[in-house]
Interface confidence: medium
Amino acid sequence: TIPPHVQKSVNNDMIVTDNNGAVKFPQLCKFCDVRFSTCDNQKSCMSNCSITSICEKPQEVCVAVWRKNDENITLETVCHDPKLPYHDFILEDAASPKCIMKEKKKPGETFFMCSCSSDECNDNIIFSEEYNTSNPDLLLVIFQ
């Protein structure tokens, strides 16, 4: 998708629903495209992206991509349709409410990607599997 400052008019009358029949409304996601990042060797990071966008299409989810090479670290935040690959990878975790980073094989760099389907969920990117929990007390600790 594209951020609001370059969005074209859209009028899609189709009602998009999830597998349970619940209506899918356009999501709010962090949308800073690619930015340099200081996120490294941490269990979780904030995106430090100040742009919250309404995704263009109801089916789109939030995506974050963390990349590290010999020169720098970048974090990409966007909206994207999970039916379409992103960076040649399928968004297999698109239904998750949290952005749990998974490593992908990319030559010459360390590449992690996550996707999620709650508002602004790509603002909090989680690397450690121990944080992938439904314990609400732990969630409060992580995200405060």
Epitope: P4, H5, Q7, K8, S9, D18, A22, V23, K24, F25, P26, Q27, L28, T52, S53, I54, P97, K98, S117, S118, D119, E120, C121, D123, N124, P136, L139, L140, F143, Q144
Partner: antibody
């Protein structure tokens, strides 16, 4: 389809308290930021406050005129949003709408009248 | 807080007329502007988001434009059901703020 139904409005004296509820259905409530917006009789729209998702800590934000007096909470297990209003003033008299933050879904509104 | 100023505050028009409502922000809000329509006794209805994106189900006679501080809502050919009050709202920063409204009445 998406439905937001407010309840709990009514007549209350200045200094009193009231709790509004908003029952949500037809969408994944726990994934959504939710807001309250109000409209005084014959006046324009005024944003009251919002609550973010529990996944991101359930942070709340408020407009200056209600900060410290109003609180917003959510019960994702009941798909319900709440607005607790304390120390009510006559200028809080308005129709209060529950909304899916920044998007097209709004409830029908519930009237709160603060008067002695 | 960002102030939103709409003009005119009211206007009279006939069916078939082209109607333009403007909204000015007190500082740049990029394209973070929404337009709502409200009829008496009803909840507001989102028409346009992100300054120019038409909300699904909204007739194509409604269009939005602008960025930065100056925005426009245009109704290309006014229909009987379009007589209502229109509000702009910025979603660039918290608190989101609304314009004071523009009432479109029948001439």
């Amino acid at each position: 389809q998406v439905q937001l139904v407010e309840s709990g409005g009514g007549l209350v004296e200045p200094g009193g308290s009231l709790r509004l509820s908003c029952a949500a259905s037809g969408f994944t409530f726990s994934n959504a930021w939710m807001s309250w917006v109000r409209q005084a009789p014959g006046k324009g729209l005024e944003w009251v406050g919002r609550i973010k998702t529990t996944y991101s800590g359930g942070a709340t934000e408020f407009a200056a005129p209600v900060k410290g007096r109003f609180t917003i909470s959510r019960d994702d297990s009941k798909n319900t949003l709440y607005l607790q209003m304390n120390s009510l003033k006559t200028e809080d008299t308005a129709v209060y709408y529950c909304t899916l933050d920044l998007r097209k879904y709004w409830g029908q509104g519930t009237l709160v009248t603060v008067s002695s | 807080d960002i102030q939103m100023t709409q003009s005119p505050s009211s206007l009279s028009a006939s069916v078939g007329d082209r109607v333009t409502i403007t909204c000015r922000a007190s500082q740049s809000i990029s394209s973070y502007l929404n337009w709502y329509q409200q009829k008496p006794g009803k909840a507001p209805k989102l028409l346009i988001y992100a300054a120019s994106s038409l909300q699904s189900g909204v007739p194509s006679r409604f269009s939005g434009s602008g960025s930065g501080t100056d925005f426009t809502l245009t109704i290309s050919s006014l229909q009987p059901e379009d007589f209502a009050t229109y509000y702009c709202q910025q979603s660039y920063s918290t608190p989101p703020t609304f314009g004071q409204g523009t009432k479109v009445e029948i001439k």
